[in-house]
Interface confidence: low
Amino acid sequence: IVLRPSRVHNSEENTMRALTLKDILNGTFSYKTFFPNWISGQEYLHQSADNNIVLYNIETGQSYTILSNRTMKSVNASNYGLSPDRQFVYLESDYSKLWRYSYTATYYIYDLSNGEFVRGNELPRPIQYLCWSPVGSKLAYVYQNNIYLKQRPGDPPFQITFNGRENKIFNGIPDWVYEEEMLATKYALWWSPNGKFLAYAEFNDTDIPVIAYSYYGDEQYPRTINIPYPKAGAKNPVVRIFIIDTTYPAYVGPQEVPVPAMIASSDYYFSWLTWVTDERVCLQWLKRVQNVSVLSICDFREDWQTWDCPKTQEHIEESRTGWAGGFFVSTPVFSYDAISYYKIFSDKDGYKHIHYIKDTVENAIQITSGKWEAINIFRVTQDSLFYSSNEFEEYPGRRNIYRISIGSYPPSKKCVTCHLRKERCQYYTASFSDYAKYYALVCYGPGIPISTLHDGRTDQEIKILEENKELENALKNIQLPKEEIKKLEVDEITLWYKMILPPQFDRSKKYPLLIQVYGGPCSQSVRSVFAVNWISYLASKEGMVIALVDGRGTAFQGDKLLYAVYRKLGVYEVEDQITAVRKFIEMGFIDEKRIAIWGWSYGGYVSSLALASGTGLFKCGIAVAPVSSWEYYASVYTERFMGLPTKDDNLEHYKNSTVMARAEYFRNVDYLLIHGTADDNVHFQNSAQIAKALVNAQVDFQAMWYSDQNHGLSGLSTNHLYTHMTHFLKQCFSLSD
């Protein structure tokens, strides 16, 4: 059980107040984290509260401003990047968001040696991506879908690619589907460790069908947004990987890296690139049917100036029970011999664990094991491997950081974080300096988040970087809800749940229940993290019980649970939410006439199907930006879990799993359907089709659209959305306004 800080002494009770919706919408109780921007083994940069860029040296204890807020303000900079030789800083301004990760910006280069902006050969605008080389001060940037290189900031640019074209050919940046569903970055170029080579991807979207939607703006005619967007079964982008020698870029030009034969025989994806040395690179490829992944290690051939990827350096990863990997296929972390590597994949018992691969995957040495999962490898040094897992005390929703000593035999394991601040901190991430000389730990909860700095050799805490004192003080007179994380055992399935209870919760009373669901493959909602959000308010002020349940298809509890939904989306996720609700009713404090469910995105899909399940459990529910048919969603994501929408593959379940097919079942529930009209991700089409099916079935429902808003419904739309949903729920639960 996790009890959140909440005062219950009678003397204090009259000074305590419940959370208000305004608190949530204003972000009154948001927290800060501190991630050092490491620039060496013992130095990091940080942007101070007054916007100076400050360099901290941990060993001398000294700090000094390398860039003043005045310089930042002179170009309205909102971000910066120091060149590795510390001679220049790029300043980023005019940020203009595109998709989830991508944005364009204007870049200015500031010369630290003379305190002036670099004049002459200035960068064009707007730039789609810009980065320094890992050594020195070379610049690579993407402008108008082409890649350019500068040997020094003041030099004229060398144009590497020439075929870039908006919505057609993308060089060094991903197209929509690679950005959202494969790379999860705004860039698709990678410097070699010492900056000798630059690798980049070229995405050809020429033949991809285009999603078009209206952007209303305030013009007489709406604009049409066109995005090459492959939906399930559609034609996909064609990807090629090139590498250019940045010292003599004009000498031989970009050289294409060959695709493994077993991958190239049918549709495929490129999934990631990892440099090993300046002359060795590792590429990961994936078949379109995403249960076979190939890791290919390629070497530079000086004599031919080409890249050679011998079959002996191809490592195949295959899943026989689901798709390859978790959400993505994991990436390798190479050891100092520059050929062997550490990688997370399923062991024979179906749990994701760290393996050490020296020659073949078949001969991999398992490094971690147990009925829990290794989640991320942070750093490998000569003698230590740092990783995170959910092993400690068998709570899948926790994250602790571990160190394995690989320099000694047998390797010994130590939990770095398990006992540091046990009540406050059970969910960590980490950020390491060069050679793991120092590291920062960022604790996300369940107590108030705290960031600390540690010695990489002894794990000793050096200092607190951010402890959110103001937040702690602000919460002193707030009646926060209580939270508990527990599990249900049902038919050999473990369903972990988080319950958020009103501050004066009394087991003998009856409370309305709201289920908040996401439930997408490889997701996790039940996590030991701190949050003061909309559902906190609903429990604190409106007296609701809120529950989150991780059912089949969710992550970090083994492949049996994860791959249960393979080729069958929309079945078990819904069943498990319903099962949990029945168990909650049995607990005795839920008013079974006042149960609701809500979710966003995949959660909107699950909440819609739950409402249309015909169980009579739910009085009402909300779907925000739901998927309504898997034929409408992106190929890379959808086909990973569902296969292809073809007769000889899985078309039948594509058809059976739509929300529209269950339109009749909405007759006995109150349904609120919400979507942004400019949703580039889950297209408005999804909700349009639900609405059409409900109208055709003559089923009453409520709806709200947000004009020109994307999948995030940000800005003023957020306030309107949560206010609207609050009214809907209060009406449903007969709570006075």
């Epitope: 605008r125 108008q144 908006e166 703006g217 013009e219 604009r223 049409t224």
Partner: nanobody, 123 residues
Framework: QVQLQESGGGLVQAGGSLRLSCAAS????????IGWFRQAPGKERELVAS???????NYADSVKGRFTISRDNAEKTVYLQMMSLEPEATGVYYC?????????????????WGQGTQVTVSS
């Protein structure tokens, strides 16, 4: 589909002013970004100023503060007001249109072009 026709060019003394017009035909003119490009003798076409479908403007550094681009969607016309002209401004001025961002400066990224109008600034 849009057709573009420039006018307003001519001979002017250094320090003088000119106003170029770009008249468009086509029902969906307001959906397009419009740019003015200059091609000096023996040089590539370069973007001088552009205006998005929503009215956001963008200028080359060399003309900032002296040139003003504006659009009248009702008249289906875009204007380029050029003040304090210098001899370097001499060239053929082309009006171009594209469906999308107005910030693209490469002429190959613009879809529709007018015939051009000559501007000569004498010293």
């Amino acid at each position: 589909q849009v057709q573009l026709q420039e006018s307003g060019g001519g001979l002017v003394q250094a320090g003088g002013s000119l106003r170029l017009s770009c008249a468009a035909s086509g029902r969906t003119f307001s959906m397009y970004a419009i740019g003015w490009f200059r091609q000096a003798p023996g040089k590539e076409r370069e973007l001088v100023a552009s205006i998005s479908s929503g009215g956001s403007t963008n200028y080359a550094d060399s003309v900032k503060g002296r040139f003003t681009i504006s659009r009248d969607n009702a008249e289906k016309t875009v204007y380029l007001q050029m003040m304090s002209l210098e001899p370097e401004a001499t060239g053929v001025y082309y009006c171009a249109a594209r469906d999308g961002s107005a910030l693209y400066t490469a002429h190959s990224d613009w879809d529709y072009w007018g015939q051009g109008t000559q501007v000569t600034v004498s010293s």
